[in-house]
Amino acid sequence: ISYDSPDYTDESCTFKISLRNFRSILSWELKNHSIVPTHYTLLYTIMSKPEDLKVVKNCANTTRSFCDLTDEWRSTHEAYVTVLEGFSGNTTLFSCSHNFWLAIDMSFEPPEFEIVGFTNHINVMVKFPSIVEEELQFDLSLVIEEQSEGIVKKHKPEIKGNMSGNFTYIIDKLIPNTNYCVSVYLEHSDEQAVIKSPLKCTLLPPGQESESAESAK
């Protein structure tokens, strides 16, 4: 029986699968906030081998509303049949199911990064995990956006090999004594909607000429 009817939202769940710091994180939200489970259990199987409905060990009887599936969901070619059960004590309050295709449903959260401003360039240090599984690379491109005085420039650095370890990119040929803001995000080849990081801004220090001009006054 399909319970996807739009007007029936009582205890239904909203699921989201995200690649966060190159870990597959499934999160969920209950539409009816009057139902408060004491704990959840997450189960899944793959559509091509449905017999084995498996409880996710670190998401059995959990009080969290998310689950790290990095070590469970490895294939971008499989459909994952997912079941979330909500409990109050020993009573099963609800069962929500959803089918996921990682290649289609995954959203890519931006990596952590820091910026350091110099007179005419900015060092952008992007933090990737030290080891990233091959399956979780997803044909992603790193995009660094530079914004200043209403002008946005996109930089697509070429990363040799895997996106792993720390990566530094230099945005050069900048104007001293100017405010620049930087955002980073991961872009997928399928033109999915991107999630941009919040902007980080820096006012570049003045250049040598303006410094000497200042000291001459």
């Epitope: 029986i1 399909s2 205890e11 769940c13 409905l53 309050l93 959803h98």
Partner: nanobody, 122 residues
């Protein structure tokens, strides 16, 4: 609360008809559902299965006599049983699972009801 509640069982003469119902609550998303039965001293036997898209399958001995259907709005699963035979006597159970049909679906279905007794006399 997650529940499957069967009703509609009873006693009937051979050749008669019964309509079983199964009221589902607490399920959200897409589930396939089915009916299986168990007679005293016998193994569980699959009867009929319906996918979330409405496609159906039946055990060979019930094809043409039994019809499975569902009402999505009311969240009720039905089993219309015609031309009943004494060998159809059993407890009939409703089951639900997020997985589409597979060979051992009836044995492995995650959710099941308490059952309703059907007795067919000759």
């Amino acid at each position: 609360q997650v529940q499957l509640q069967e009703s509609g069982g009873g006693s009937v003469q051979a050749g008669g008809s019964l309509r079983l119902s199964c009221a589902a609550s607490g399920f959200y998303g897409t589930y396939s559902m089915g009916w299986f039965r168990q007679a005293p001293g016998k193994e569980r036997e699959g009867v009929a299965h319906i996918e979330s898209d409405g496609s159906t399958r039946y055990a060979d001995s019930m094809k043409g006599r039994f019809t499975v259907s569902k009402d999505n709005a009311k969240k009720i699963l039905y089993l219309q049983m015609n031309s009943l035979k004494p060998e159809d006597t059993a407890v009939y159970y409703c089951a639900a699972d997020p997985r589409p049909y597979f060979r051992t679906w009836y044995e492995r279905a995650r959710y099941g009801g308490q059952g309703t007794q059907v007795t067919v006399s000759s």
